[in-house]
Every structure is written in C-alpha cells, then in structure tokens.
C-alpha cells in the first residue's frame, strides 16, 4: 500500500497550477471504499501498479487517493436543456505522477504515469447518486462508470438512470 505522505486533507498546496487549462477548485486526500465497505488498494507489482478491491484486516492502514476537483462548463447545445450547466469532474491520484485512467477499449481502470496536461481519460464526472456515496463517470465515454467487478475496478456501462444507484458503481470517500 502507498499514499501521499505528509499531506493534510484539503490544505495541501495545489499540485501544478493548471490541468487542461484549469485549476482544481479543491483537492481532497481520502481513502476510497466500495458501497459494501471494501477498500480500494494499490500495489506495485513488476514495475506497474495494480488496483485491488479487498477487505482490510483490522487496524490495517487504508490507501489514500488525492482527488482533484474541477469545474467544467457544459454547453447548452450538449446539455439538451437550453441552458449552460456546470459539472464537477475529478482526477484520482494514489501516488505522485500516477492517475487512474479509463481504458474504454479494455473496459478497465488502470494506473498510468503521465505528465500535465492530463488526458481526458483521467477525468471523471462526479455523481452524488446515493446518500453520501459518489460515482465516477468517464468523461470520454458518457454512461460508463468506474465499478467493481471480480474484486477489481472495471468500467461498467449503465443503461438507464434507474440503474445509477446500483451498488457496484457506488463509492465512499473517507478521511480515515
């Protein structure tokens, strides 16, 4: 397990001033767990990082992820509402220079080392779809969310808004 040492939630200096031309409105260091309270953990194996969904032993330290929140304007011609809207997007970084990426071809979630500006595959639209849980929708593939499949993170297609509360795409953020 690894994390970002010495970083206080919300109060760290924003790393890099600009990502795709915009700065994060806030950053948040948190552990990520599933709706069923399994932890999302990260491990270095054979020079690449693996992502796991697992039950932690009692008192085992949870891995932290730096969530950077960005405000994105959504033009009315895309929204279908006739009005411009705003949405929150996030990037998730469990360790320096590595970000979660959506691999839409493989329907997988991967950790990639990359430089700024980050590619669109590293951005996820944030949803509050259930009390105090969040979901992460691929910026590059609307309707596709980070989810849990076979104890790993995967990309899961959600067919209708009624399925947005399905447990395998719901995550909890915690400072502990």
């Amino acid at each position: 397990a690894f994390g970002i040492s010495g970083v206080q939630k919300y109060t760290r200096a924003l790393h890099d001033s600009s990502i795709t031309g915009i700065s994060p409105i806030t950053e948040y260091l948190a552990s990520l767990s599933t709706y069923n309270d399994q932890s999302i953990t990260f491990a270095l194996e054979d020079e690449s990082y693996e992502i796991y969904v697992e039950d932690l032993k009692k008192d085992e330290k949870k891995d932290k992820v730096l969530l950077s929140y960005y405000e994105s304007q959504h033009p009315s011609n895309e929204s279908g509402d006739g009005v411009d809207g705003k949405m929150l997007m996030v990037t998730l970084s469990p360790t320096k220079d590595f970000w979660l990426h959506a691999n839409n071809k493989e329907h997988s979630v991967e950790l990639h080392k990359c430089e700024k500006p980050l590619p669109d595959q590293a951005f996820f639209v944030l949803h509050n779809m259930h009390s105090n849980c969040v979901s992460f929708e691929c910026k590059t593939d609307p309707g596709v969310f980070i989810g849990v499949k076979d104890n790993h993170l995967a990309l899961i297609k959600v067919d209708s808004s009624e399925n947005l509360c399905t447990e395998n795409i719901l995550f909890k953020l915690s400072e502990t």
Partner: antibody
Amino acid sequence: QVQLQESGPGLVKPSETLSLTCTVSGFSLSKYGVHWIRQPPGKGLEWIGVLRAGGSTGYNSALMSRVTISKDTSKSQVSLKLSSVTAADTAVYYCARDHYYYSSYGGFVYWGQGTLVTVSS
Amino acid sequence: DIQMTQSPSSVSASVGDRVTITCLASQTIGAWLAWYQQKPGKSPKLLIYAATRLADGVPSRFSGSGSGTDFTLTISSLQPEDFATYYCQQLDSSPYTFGQGTKVEIK
C-alpha cells in the same frame, strides 16, 4: 430559462398530510437534483430533503419518518408529502435546484419563490 | 448529522464597513460549503459555493474562505443593498444542514 414554482394548499389541518408540488422548467430532472427547504415565520432555513438526478432520495433525519419526495418526469414535477403535521410545520416551503449536474456539492443556485403553508384547525 | 454554527447571530454595521461572518462545522466538510443571502419576503440567493467560488452575477466585494471546519464570508465594503440575513450550508454529506443565520443590520 430555469424556473421552479411551488404550489399546493396554503392551509392544512393538524394530523393531516401536507402535499406540495414543484413544477420545473428550463432543465431536466434527470440531470439535476431538486431539494425542498422550509422556513418557519421569523426563523432560519431548514433542509427537508432531495430528489437526486438518479432518482434516489435523501431526507432530514428529524423528518424522515414523515416525509416523502417523488417525481413525475413527464410533468416535470417534484412532489413533497409531509404526514401528521402540527403547528410546528407552519412555514414557507421552497424548492431549489442543484448548481451542478448530478451533484449537490455546489449548493442551490435556482429557487422557487416559496409558498406559505399554515397548519391550523 | 453535521451541525453548522454561525457567528455572530447579528451584526450592526455602516455602509462602507468590512463585515465578516464565520461558520463552524461540527466535522470536516472539505470545501463543500455555500453561503446565501436572504432579504425579507424573498427566496435565498446563492453567493458563494465550494467555500470560495463566487456565484454568477455576485459582486466581487463578497468573498469566501476556509476549508475543513472553519469558514468565513467577508463583505469588503458594505453597500445599502447588502443589509440582509446570511446563511451558510454544508453540502459534504446529507442531510445538508444550514447555519442558523446572521442578520446584518444598519447601525
């Protein structure tokens, strides 16, 4: 443009159910959450609950046993029902829309004008 | 539930004064705090969201600061139209609780 309009009876008898409707226009209920907030005369704001874009609901803990929020997407309406009302439920009731698509983190940017509901026999 | 405590409950000030209102959350809420202005008989108006971001159309004399549990709304130079009641609200977790309000009155 974005509009929210509350409607319903201005007078409800004690022990009955208060029913209000918020009719919205200029945005989609599948993209934005709609909240109900109330304000007793001369007092502060109290959050009642939310109908989220995905269809799930969240409620004020103190009111949870009495409150139901639902929607009729075809009519662009969000309904509030509050059962077993007492004089303490007398208030101006507002509906309001989330600032962000899909998320309540940004607060409520659009509000209805509010409707006064008096609970009295 | 997260409790939001605003102070002061009222403040008397003159046009041109700098006014500061604070809001304290009972647990950490990150940056997920909004400030509203309400005038008698009117609906609340969003001033600040995400603790520091100015809502569209809000004059730049309004500013927000803070994160975690301690937040501040500042009016740098009070104008006649700013006499109103101000509320903070946490949006980190449901139920989305409000502070009790701060009334800004004419001295």
